[in-house]
């Protein structure tokens, strides 16, 4: 094209239907210039214009020759251009924001605009660029792209953005532009101009404010606070930590807290200070609810279901910000809610759910929700298998008879369809407790009854009970303990009896032992003693308890003595014992030694002994009749250990073994013995009977039995040169090689002659006795031998 001709042809479109082509006028042309524009492809079209632009329908593919003829006062000039779609720019119209609004409570901006899709017939992708600016200085804070599609009609679009800074803190501006991406368009695609700017600012409802107010935030998050103020803010603190101030418009300031720590239950103070004032807000930094843990649903009474759980990690949010729980049952659609101020402990939480008629299986979902999030746990339960019965109450015990009682208790709930397994704890004083299990049918009215037999009469029992369902889930807690004394029954056995003839042989003394509780079956009130021979039976007057001895004047004929114990219910079977003693001329006294606590006695089996054996014992130093205690053992026994709390070491006891045949007792063995031997308590008394120039004759006496404290096994006699009241060593002092010792093991020996001595010499003599329990104390004497003649 010639210089001074139209130039710089440029075509743009905003809808791909119409191209708007414009050019620059030749230099020097005035206002009154006309143009002829001709477009030529296979045909030619010409247009007369008075301006430097023309709107033409979009040309189909291919090259077009455009001729622009400029007609002006001083002649004309012509320019030729080749036009192709590739030379055309697609520039969308400048978009317009229809509405910009804000939710100050959440610091969220809401943007609304129209894509004006009706002017664009072709389906195209649109990229929108949204710009958020802050403060009067319009600092860019957010630039995002947003993709939509043009579909031939006007469509409203929405976009929202949550600001990191509360919207009250500063003015916020928003502007948008767009870019159309059309697959069928081969020309240049360009961004639209930016829309006119819209802004959001907060109209203060007081002179000063801190934002946000009472915000709940996740621990570890970042958060911005600001103080909207007309006076200069001097400092800002979170808790006790000073924060650097970020200056906004005017005197407004902000602080940014990064990685916020968990708050106390009262929240964390955020405080801004000015010269004259102090302003605060509170931030609650916590956690969303943890998944409820150990969710468990059970019932005490088949009327109400108790679902309990552990809340897991503490949220640190309390009061109105605490976790609320909703328990939903999906089969019925029913639900219950729990809203509580969270305690700082991991205690168990619970909700009560009313059971529904004819529903046994429940599908529970526990939803947990707080301002920071939600979580849930589920559980499917057959509630008849999850019965944790209440503690049995009104537990009572009533007598049936002396060996059976009736237990009754109250267990609230409607259990008509299930069975209970109840465990009864039975405790006798000073005895091992016994457990008995009973299965009973559940009832509607909550009252239960069971009979308990095989008890002992006149025994103090302590009962308690707990129950579970037969399909075991949990035992109930134990009921209160109930003490009960069973009623009396007749004594089940006669007393253990023995008899002794008095020392003058004229009276028979009958002894008996008190019946043990389990045989007395009640409080023994008295005893009946009777004496019978072939001819007659003679009864003594009733002997009141606690007397356990009776004396009858009898001749040496054969009598059977009968002892009966009586309580308030009746009499025991009689205990019988014969007065007759079968003689035994073949008796030797034996020695026995025990094992510290008791003494083991053994004997040979004797088939003639048909009733029993009796071992009686007494302290051998006591006068006749000698009786301390006795023990009966069965006739098939060949040994027994005799133990008694009264046995003492070093005391000699007499033991007598009697065998019983044809109701008469025969003394089989007579023994003396010790439970434990000790050393003698005294030394033997000794004297010098005779002295010569080379010998001394010593004589000693027996030690009394009480002072021997064991069986005498011998004497130790020590002698050696030594003088009374001198510094020369005594006989028993160690290291003396000239001391001689004689061990006398013949305990019948009572004298000793010491020979081969030196004349007119002082000798120190010492005598000691010993038992298997040790050597007794010494007795000493100084003797001077006679002069050699």
């Amino acid at each position: 094209q010639k210089k001074g001709a139209p130039h710089d042809l440029k075509c743009v479109t905003n809808n791909l239907q119409v191209w708007n082509c414009s050019w620059k006028a030749p230099s020097g042309t005035g206002r009154g210039t006309d143009y002829e524009v001709c477009i030529e492809n296979r045909s030619r079209s010409c247009y007369q214009l008075e301006k430097t632009s023309i709107k033409i329908p979009a040309l189909s593919h291919g090259d077009y020759e455009i001729t622009i003829n400029s007609l002006h006062d001083f002649g004309s000039s012509t320019s030729k251009f080749t036009l192709n779609e590739q030379n055309v720019s697609l520039i969308p119209d400048t978009p317009e924001i229809l509405n910009l609004s804000a939710d100050f409570s959440t610091s969220t901006l809401y943007l609304k605009w129209n894509d004006r899709g009706s002017v664009f017939p072709h389906r195209s992708n649109v990229i929108w660029e949204i710009k958020v600016l802050r403060k009067e200085s319009m600092e860019l804070v957010k630039l995002v792209t947003h993709n939509t599609t043009l579909n031939g009609k006007d469509t409203l679009h929405h976009w929202s953005w949550a600001s990191d800074m509360p919207l009250e803190c500063a003015i916020h501006f928003v502007e948008i532009r767009c870019y159309i991406d059309n697959l069928h368009f081969s020309g240049l695609e360009e961004w639209s101009d930016w829309s006119p700017v819209k802004n959001i600012s907060w109209i203060p409802d007081s002179q000063t404010k801190v934002f946000p107010q009472d915000k709940v935030i996740l621990v570890g998050s970042d958060i911005t606070f600001c103080c909207v103020s007309q006076e200069k803010v001097l400092s800002a603190l979170i808790g006790h930590t000073n924060c650097p101030l970020i200056h906004l418009d005017g005197e407004n300031v902000a602080i940014k807290i990064r990685n916020i720590s968990v708050s106390a239950s009262s929240g964390t103070n955020v405080v801004f200070t000015t010269e004259d004032n102090i302003f605060g807000t509170v931030i609650f930094a916590g956690y969303p609810p943890d998944t409820p843990q150990q969710l468990n649903c059970e019932t005490h009474d088949l009327k109400e279901i108790i679902c309990s759980w552990n809340p897991g990690r503490v949220t640190a949010l309390v009061g109105p910000r605490a976790t609320s729980y909703t328990l939903v049952e999906s089969f019925s659609g029913k639900y219950v809610r729990l809203k509580r101020a969270e305690a700082p402990t991991n205690e168990s939480y619970q909700l009560l759910f009313q059971m529904l008629p004819n529903q046994e299986i429940y599908n529970f979902t526990l939803n947990a929700h707080n301002p920071l999030g939600r979580s849930q746990s589920t559980i499917l339960v057959n509630i008849t298998e999850k019965v944790y019965p209440h503690t049995p109450t009104s537990f009572k015990v009533k007598d049936i008879n002396s060996t059976a009682v009736k237990l009754s208790w109250h267990l609230p709930g409607n259990f008509a369809k299930i069975n209970f397994l109840c465990e009864i704890e039975i405790k006798k004083s000073n005895s091992v407790q016994e457990q008995r299990n009973v299965t009973i049918k559940g009832v509607e009215n909550s009252s239960y009854l069971v009979a308990l037999d095989k008890l002992n009469p006149y025994t103090l029992y302590t009962f308690r009970i707990r129950c579970s369902t037969e399909t075991f889930w949990k035992w109930s807690k134990w009921s209160n303990k109930k003490q009960h004394l069973t009623t009396e029954a007749s004594p089940s056995k006669g007393p253990d009896t023995w008899r002794e003839w008095s020392s003058d042989g004229k009276n028979l003394i009958i002894y008996w032992k008190p019946l043990p509780i389990n045989e007395a079956n009640g409080k023994i009130l008295s005893y009946n003693v009777s004496c019978s021979s072939d001819e007659e039976t003679q009864s003594l007057s009733e002997i009141p308890d606690p007397q356990h001895k009776a004396e009858i004047r009898l001749d040496k004929n054969d009598y059977i003595i009968s002892v009966v114990a009586k309580n308030s219910v009746g009499s025991s079977p009689p205990s019988k014992i014969a007065s007759m003693e079968i003689p035994n001329d073949d008796l030797k006294i034996e020695q026995v030694v025990g094992m510290g606590k008791g003494i083991l006695l053994t004997w040979h089996y004797d088939p003639n002994m048909t009733c029993d054996y009796v071992i009686k014992w007494c302290n051998s130093s006591r006068s006749e009749p000698c009786l301390m205690d006795w023990r009966k053992v069965p006739s098939n026994s060949t040994e027994t250990v005799i133990e008694s709390d009264e046995f003492r070491p070093g005391i000699r006891y007499n033991f007598f073994l009697y065998g019983c045949r044809n109701q008469g007792y025969q003394l089989l063995r007579s023994m003396i013995g010790y439970i434990e031997e000790l050393a003698p308590i005294v030394a033997p008394n000794f004297t010098v009977e005779d002295t010569s120039a080379d010998s001394i004759l010593v004589k000693w006496e027996d030690i009394p039995v009480e002072e021997l404290r064991g069986f005498l096994r011998g004497y130790l006699f020590y002698f050696g040169k030594g003088e009374r009241d001198t510094s020369k060593m005594r006989v028993l002092e160690s290291g003396r090689s000239d001391i001689k010792v004689k061990n006398i093991t013949d305990i019948s020996q009572k004298t000793l002659r010491i020979a081969d001595l030196q004349g007119k010499t002082s000798y120190h003599l010492v005598l000691r006795a010993y038992t298997d329990g040790g050597v007794g104390p010494e007795k000493s004497m100084y003797v001077v031998t006679k002069e050699n003649s």
Epitope: T208, V210, G267, N269, V271, I278, G280
Partner: antibody, heavy 122, light 108 residues
Framework: QVQLVESGGGVVQPGRSLRLSCAAS????????MDWVRQAPGKGLEWVAV????????YYADSVKGRFTISRDNSKNTLYLQMNSLRAEDTAVYYC???????????????WGQGTLVTVSS | KIVLTQSPGTLSLSPGGRATLSCRAS???????LAWYQQKPGQAPRLLIY???NRATGIPDRFSGSGSGTDFTLTISRLEPEDFAVYYC?????????FGPGIKVDIK
């Protein structure tokens, strides 16, 4: 137990000065913010001034700003209120009060003294 | 400054009755910064409730607080003879800290 005892009240002429003291015991005085609150005869409560636990910041009600000064001596466990240019409308029972939270900066008042009466009259 | 209004000015009730006391703020305040006090004649005020709903140490559970924003309530579920007194609300979230004018609860 926590005790706050005010003293220094009395009758004073308008334009004159008065210094109130509050002796604290039974707690760590240096860890708590302290306030003065007053109550005119037969009227409600009016907050007067606050001083932070460490004495670093002091704030006043508009009605006393520039005339009253709050201070504290943590070594003596004592809070003070210096009242200058007294006016008839300053007549009230003056209470000292301890803030609830240890070391906190914004708290309600959990312990109060029994008060001391200030009468401004010519 | 934040102005607190309390209503009603006087509440005449019988022992055992329920008292509902209202406190309204001239602008929204953080519930964390609202307290209630009780004052009996000739005595210093006593802190009942802080942070709108938390009972102070030693305060019986018949006293409860609620509310947020600009409207707060103190409820006494069953009035005891010793509860007849004047009740003040207070905001302590921004200076000047302000008290309400008080509500007198007296015996009917």
């Amino acid at each position: 137990q926590v005790q706050l005892v005010e003293s220094g009240g009395g009758v004073v002429q308008p334009g004159r000065s008065l210094r109130l003291s509050c002796a604290a015991s039974g707690f760590t005085f240096s860890s708590y913010g302290m306030d003065w609150v007053r109550q005119a005869p037969g009227k409600g409560l009016e907050w007067v001034a606050v001083i932070w636990y460490d004495g670093s910041n002091k704030y006043y009600a508009d009605s006393v700003k520039g005339r009253f000064t709050i201070s504290r001596d943590n070594s003596k466990n004592t809070l003070y209120l210096q009242m200058n240019s007294l006016r008839a409308e300053d007549t009230a029972v003056y209470y000292c009060a301890r803030e609830l939270w240890f070391g906190e900066l914004l708290s309600p008042f959990d312990f109060w003294g029994q008060g001391t009466l200030v009468t401004v009259s010519s | 400054k934040i102005v607190l209004t309390q209503s009603p000015g006087t509440l005449s009730l019988s022992p055992g009755g329920r008292a509902t006391l209202s406190c309204r703020a001239s602008q929204s305040i953080s519930s964390s910064y609202l307290a209630w006090y009780q004052q009996k004649p000739g005595q210093a005020p006593r802190l009942l409730i802080y942070a709108a709903s938390n009972r102070a140490t030693g305060i019986p559970d018949r006293f409860s607080g609620s509310g947020s924003g600009t409207d707060f309530t103190l409820t006494i579920s069953r009035l005891e003879p010793e509860d007849f007194a004047v009740y003040y609300c207070q905001q302590y979230g921004s200076s000047p800290f302000t008290f309400g004018p008080g509500i007198k609860v007296d015996i009917k």
